[in-house]
């Protein structure tokens, strides 16, 4: 039960996280105009990974895409790459984890296969979350650097007569969405990895052993919920008899660490 819960929760948390990473990547507010010196502005600037926008107090908003690849800062390209890698890994991880879910049956999939898939998706989620956190952090660092550089050159005057106020940018909402989403994906991945440990049948310790009694042959299968006569193949998720309503976990035939021969 705990394994299913951990796996399911890991999947849901990762799903929310990846949705957040996608949202953050698409958002326009990665950096927003710093309003510290002028909280009441008539023109508000904000920028995303793909376009920059200007919102006028008249209500009009104009966004322009970055229609160049070579002209963009290398750091911005790196952030884009990290976020896209994060999304792709996360999406593949989600796909893999759907098939790995304990509550979903696909043919006669081995438990070891489910465990491997859970671990694979967990690792993918961890890497995806790290990519998102790294991307957002690189962008945040870039903003901090530019912020202090523009603060140092805040006013460039022409003969001390005319003031040109440089627009400074600060953290936008997308950064916080990205950090939280990356963290959730990371946590989800860790949960999947933990769930994987509970799913994996430790074959070396728990091999079935046969005892031959004088009257008839009885095989005792450790971890099973019913002993069967002969060498029946009930080591998997198959019910011999369901006398009442039971949850999926109550009818599992996985060995546990407390089952000894």
């Amino acid at each position: 039960m705990a394994v299913t819960a951990c796996q399911g929760l890991g999947f849901v948390v990762s799903l929310i996280g990846i949705a957040g990473i996608i949202a953050a990547t698409c958002m326009d507010q990665w950096s927003t105009q710093d309003l510290y010196n002028n909280p009441v502005t008539a023109v508000f600037n904000y920028q995303g990974l793909w376009r920059s926008c200007v919102r006028e107090s008249s209500g009009f908003t104009e966004c322009r895409g970055y229609f160049t690849l070579l002209g963009l800062p290398a750091m911005l390209q790196a952030v884009r790459a990290l976020m896209i890698v994060g999304i792709v890994l996360g999406a593949i991880g989600l796909l893999v984890s759907i098939f790995a879910l304990k509550c979903i049956r696909i043919g006669s999939m081995e438990d070891s296969a489910k465990a491997n898939m859970t671990l694979t998706s967990g690792i993918m989620f961890i890497v995806s979350g790290l990519c998102a956190i790294a991307g957002v952090s690189v962008f945040a660092n870039m903003l901090v650097t530019n912020f202090w550089m523009s603060t140092a050159n805040m006013y460039t005057g022409m003969g001390g007569m005319v003031q040109t106020v440089q627009t400074r940018y600060t953290f936008g909402a997308a950064l916080f969405v990205g950090w939280v989403a990356g963290g959730l994906t990371l946590i989800g991945g860790v949960m999947m990895c933990i769930a994987c440990r509970g799913l994996a049948p430790e074959e070396t310790n728990y091999k079935a052993v046969s005892y031959h009694a004088s009257g008839h042959s009885v095989a005792y299968k450790p971890g099973g919920f019913k002993a069967s006569t002969g060498f029946g193949s009930n080591t998997k998720n198959k019910k011999i008899y369901d006398g009442g309503a039971r949850t999926e976990d109550e009818v599992q035939s996985y060995p546990s660490k407390h089952d000894y021969v």
């Epitope: 600037n45 926008c53 006028e56 008249s58 003031q163 627009t167």
Partner: antibody, heavy 118, light 113 residues
Framework: EVMLVESGGGLMKPGGSLKLSCAAS????????MSWVRQTPEKRLEWVAT????????YYPDSVKGRFTISRDNAKNTLYLQMSSLRSEDTAMYYC???????????WGQGTSVTVSS | DIVMTQSPSSLTVTAGEKVTLSCKSS????????????LTWYQQKPGQPPKLLIY???TRESGVPDRFTGSGSGTDFILTINSVQAEDLAVYYC?????????FGSGTKLEIK
């Protein structure tokens, strides 16, 4: 054709209050940020107040802050300017204007005259 | 506050002449986000409210004759009337539309001989 019609002006004593109205027609009033602008007897234009399309933000110059309040009723297509603690320097022709691209005052009313005198 | 200075304060010209009206701001009106200058020009004919001519320093409002041209960037702006007509008799105002409080120039009165 866009129509903005101001009303409510008149002769007031210093310290008095007055509420100006601006009725809009022939344009989507609720989509536009609106402003009040006044023109002094010396023909100088002064911006008085701006309100965003959704009523969420209002802006004023220091000269009227705390004395004037801009508001709007999108259901009635009407803009208001509540003026209190009037001073002689508030004497002017008051225009309402609809803001367009570039924060430019795209549409103007014909104006209503406010005179503050003892 | 941004101070807008217009020159000359008045100007008398002959119909058909080319006219240039100047407007200077105490701070740059160029917005780095979209590289647009938030300067607006208005025309006010006698007994009428002001009328929008040009926004973003050089974008002509629809319906405005193409003899009116706005130019300039940063702090120095010009309104050019290529071939002045009798109906251009008016006061021309420039306005800072970049930051609050919005401020207007004192105007240039254009008179026709």
């Amino acid at each position: 054709e866009v129509m903005l019609v101001e009303s409510g002006g008149g002769l007031m004593k210093p310290g008095g209050s007055l509420k100006l109205s601006c009725a809009a027609s022939e344009f989507t009033f609720s989509n536009y940020a609106m402003s009040w602008v006044r023109q002094t007897p010396e023909k100088r234009l002064e911006w008085v107040a701006t309100i965003s399309s959704g009523r969420s933000s209002t802006y004023y110059p220091d000269s009227v802050k705390g004395r004037f309040t801009i508001s709007r009723d999108n259901a009635k297509n009407t803009l208001y300017l509540q003026m209190s603690s009037l001073r002689s320097e508030d004497t002017a022709m008051y225009y309402c204007a609809g803001l367009g691209r570039g924060n430019a005052m795209e549409y103007w009313g014909q104006g209503t005259s406010v005179t503050v005198s003892s | 506050d941004i101070v807008m200075t217009q020159s000359p304060s008045s100007l008398t010209v002959t119909a058909g002449e080319k006219v240039t009206l100047s407007c200077k701001s105490s701070q740059s009106l160029l917005n780095s986000g979209n590289q647009k200058n938030y300067l607006t020009w208005y025309q006010q004919k006698p007994g009428q409210p002001p009328k929008l001519l040009i926004y973003w320093a050089s974008t002509r409002e629809s319906g405005v004759p193409d003899r009116f041209t706005g130019s300039g960037s940063g702090t120095d702006f010009i309104l050019t009337i290529n071939s002045v007509q009798a109906e251009d008799l008016a006061v021309y105002y420039c306005q800072n539309a970049y930051s609050y409080p919005f401020t207007f120039g004192s105007g240039t009165k254009l008179e026709i001989k």
